[in-house]
């Protein structure tokens, strides 16, 4: 029998290269049993993760898999960065691995920078 522990399956060191100006859904796969936990998204700023309280989020249930979605409608250049989802369940806080968005401006998509360039730009 499967355990009923809540788990967040954002893939470790995952990256998404996306274009500014287009919609994007950032998925946090959430495994739970009876009671759906309270899940939030935050964006990393140095060592702290700033809660995204004013952003559109939604749940998606699909083939026995639940996702907590952070919507980007559309993606903006300053959405570049690392994100994490967190779940509150029975007084426990569970944090996911971080996932990084590399945002490319549509105008410069033909001269798309490398992930390394984007990373150095983001962490600079």
């Amino acid at each position: 029998k499967e355990s009923c522990d809540v788990q967040l399956y954002i893939k470790r060191q995952s990256e998404h290269s996306i274009l500014a100006g287009r919609p994007f859904e950032l998925e946090c796969p959430v495994k739970y049993c009876a009671n759906r936990p309270h899940v939030t998204w935050c964006k990393l700023n140095g060592t702290t993760c700033v809660k995204l309280e004013d952003r559109q989020t939604s749940w998606k249930e699909e083939k026995n898999i639940s996702f907590f979605i952070l919507h980007f409608e559309p993606v903006l250049p300053n959405d570049n960065g690392s994100y994490r989802c967190s779940a509150n369940f029975q007084s426990n806080l569970i944090e996911s691995h971080s996932t990084t968005l590399y945002v490319t401006d549509v105008k410069s998509a033909s001269e798309r920078p490398s992930k390394d360039e984007m990373a150095s730009r983001f962490w600079a």
């Epitope: 788990q7 290269s17 996702f67």
Partner: antibody, heavy 118, light 111 residues
């Protein structure tokens, strides 16, 4: 039911480029993670890399300079390209889907056998 | 890379007896608060088939004769009782860290 089917050449000459296709039915490649794995004649399994639901990719560092994984969402296919093949790339190549809840490979293609020889 | 060491490399078991296969990881497999260790069966000419996922969960359609256990660095696949149809090579796999890696395989034969 989810089904995956590999297709591509069975024989490639050294220094040439290997191109394989994985055709997916029963699920959309804009969901989950889609992988390539190979099995060498000595039975060793090697993970090659994936393309994710968003189109982002990961490659095994042992292959990074030679490998490319791309997709065509309208055809629901994804592709493996391996450059500068040698006889060491002789193997059976599999495509497989990763499950979101732990990335285990729940559906596999039957595999396609590649021989690299002049 | 995380190295998975399977033992034994081959195993001969009498029908109806228990087969135990070990998989030892070079690093702890628990960064998701979960053990992302999985077991596959591969028969000649076929692709690998998922048996056990996340250390101890039985994949749908797999007989309850198969079970998985373990945590951190030591994991075990048990087949009890062994049947003739179980002749195959068994692999462990970790998906906790990129690149994913597989064990070297254990070939199960009937004594």
């Amino acid at each position: 039911e989810v089904q995956l089917q590999e297709s591509g050449p069975s024989l490639v000459k050294p220094s040439q480029t290997l191109s394989l296709t994985c055709s997916v039915t029963g699920d959309s490649i804009t969901s989950a993670y889609w992988n390539w794995i190979r099995k060498f004649p000595g039975n060793k399994l090697e993970y090659m890399g994936y393309i994710s639901y968003s189109g982002s990719t990961y490659f095994n560092p042992s292959l990074k300079s030679r490998i490319s994984i791309t997709r065509n969402t309208s055809k629901n296919q994804y592709y493996l390209q391996l450059n500068s093949v040698t006889t060491e790339d002789t193997a059976t190549y599999y495509c497989a889907r990763s499950h979101y809840y732990g990335y285990y490979f729940d559906y596999w293609g039957h595999g396609t056998t590649l021989t690299v020889s002049s | 890379d995380i190295v998975l060491t399977q033992s034994p490399a081959s195993l001969a078991v009498s029908l109806g007896q228990r087969a135990t296969i070990s998989c030892r990881a070079s690093e702890t497999i628990d960064s998701y608060g979960d053990s992302l260790m999985h077991w596959y069966q591969q028969k000649a000419g076929q692709p690998p088939k998922l048996l056990i996922y996340r250390a101890s969960n039985l994949e749908s359609g797999i007989p309850a004769r198969f079970s998985g256990s373990g945590s951190r660095t030591d994991f075990t696949l048990t087949i009890n009782p062994v049947e003739a149809d179980d002749v195959a090579t068994y692999y462990c796999q970790q998906t906790d860290e990129d690149p994913y890696t597989f064990g070297g395989g254990t070939k199960l034969e009937i004594k």
